[in-house]
């Protein structure tokens, strides 16, 4: 079942997602979604990475990390009850079949009449505590014309890292990283 | 227009090999997602494979996994789906379709008129 | 795998009715649906994707609905053009499938 995140009306959202780049710039493709993650890709894209760059947005969604260290957690504007839902985020490693994929399940809350005097974002995650490792053998990697040739090597969690105080005060939240090579 | 033109099948003997080609045209190639599909003499379709647009990313269903290899030259914008281990179930009409993805996933909106591979013993 | 259940195998239909071809996918696919129709001798041409979204050029006459499990593929006022076979296909999950087909005969 996909991770549970709350926000406020009117206020920012975050939605966490996180991989370790092989090496600086050697960036994977990224896309986010509005929906579950389909088959391949992403459905109702609202951003997305090439292995450069962000190379594609809709206006509100933009990731407020340094995506250039696999920060990719997608940051949604002045949300809306019609924000609530499920987003994908699929980070495209290359080689055969190797894409991970996230489910994100964001819940909108009416704005409080009296808002608190000092926290006024209430963002919860809660990722899974464990993910699966994969082994790659040579069978799996895939050697790329233009891009690194990488392989997917662990998978760990980050439980209730402060982040991004800019943000939000005491912004907490727990993600999953993806580390490659 | 939007033209895909596969080539490349024809009758081979069990445990044989084969490798098709799909010439694309009438779009930018490198833009799209690019699959195979076939259809068997019952008219059931199946997915065989797909690749992303820089090439990247492969992905196949676990009845051809370990032997259809998937590739594309965005060069010469063609597809390619290299067939090894052939048994009867790979008898079938291979149809390479291409795949819109960057603002939304859209599965297979341009088929080309296929080619006849027959597997025989 | 994602099975995709499609009823009827077979349909009699005449110019001008109303059809309607379900499909059943035996887990939840979101609306990652998308239909197909196929002429004899031809490939497939895609009808519908997103479960009711219509490509370019289909003819409204042609109407998706559903979302979870069920879906619908309804072709009002038939017209003889539409005599074809009909798939469906998710794209929720690996491996995508297909249904097995609906074939729309005449009368």
């Known amino acids: 079942s996909e991770v549970e995140y709350r926000a406020e009306v009117g206020q920012n959202a975050y939605l966490p997602c996180f991989y370790t780049p092989a090496a600086p710039g050697n960036l994977v493709p990224v896309c986010w979604g509005k929906g579950a993650c389909p088959v391949f890709e992403c459905g109702n894209v609202v951003l997305r990475t090439d292995e450069r760059d962000v190379n594609y947005w809709t206006s509100r969604y933009w990731l407020n990390g340094d995506f250039r260290k696999g920060d990719v957690s997608l940051t949604i504007e002045n949300v809306t009850l019609a924000d609530s839902g499920i987003y994908c985020c699929r980070i495209q490693i290359p080689g055969i079949m190797n894409d991970e994929k996230f489910n994100l399940k964001l819940v909108i809350k009416p704005a409080k009449v009296t808002p608190a005097p000092t926290r006024q974002r209430d963002f919860t995650a809660a990722f899974p505590r464990m993910l699966t490792t994969r082994g790659h053998g040579p069978a799996e990697t895939q050697t790329l014309g233009s891009l690194p040739d990488i392989n997917l090597t662990q998978i760990s969690t980050l439980a209730n890292e402060l982040r991004d105080s800019r943000l939000a005060n005491d912004l907490r939240d727990s993600g999953a990283t993806i580390r490659i090579g | 227009e939007v033209m895909l033109m596969e080539s490349g099948g024809g009758l081979v003997k069990l445990g044989g090999s084969l490798k098709l080609s799909c010439a694309a045209s009438?779009?930018?190639?490198?833009?799209?997602?690019m699959s195979w599909v076939r259809q068997t003499p019952e008219k059931r379709l199946e997915w065989v494979a797909t690749i992303s647009n820089s090439g990247g990313s492969t992905y196949y269903p676990d009845s051809v996994k370990d032997r259809f290899t998937i590739s594309r030259d965005n060069a010469k914008n063609t597809l390619y789906l290299q067939m090894s281990s052939l048994n009867s179930e790979d008898t079938a009409v291979y149809y390479c379709a291409r795949d819109p993805y960057y603002t939304n996933y859209v599965p297979m909106d341009y088929w080309g008129q296929g080619t006849s591979v027959t597997v025989s013993s | 795998s994602i099975v995709m259940t499609q009823t009827p195998k077979f349909m009699s239909t005449s110019v001008g009715d109303r059809v309607s071809v379900t499909c059943k996918a035996s887990q939840y696919v979101d609306t990652y649906v998308a239909w197909y129709q196929q002429k004899p001798g031809q490939s497939p041409k895609p009808l519908i994707y997103?479960?009711?979204t219509r490509h370019t050029g289909v003819p409204a006459r042609f109407t998706g609905s559903g979302s979870g499990t069920d879906f619908t593929l309804t072709i009002s006022n038939v017209q003889s053009e539409d005599l074809a076979e009909y798939f469906c296909?998710?794209?929720?999950?690996?491996?995508?499938?297909f249904g097995a087909g609906t074939k729309l005969e005449l009368k």
């Open positions: 296909a998710q794209y929720s999950s690996s491996p995508l499938t």
């Open positions: 997103s479960a009711s």
């Open positions: 009438g779009f930018t190639f490198s833009s799209y997602y």
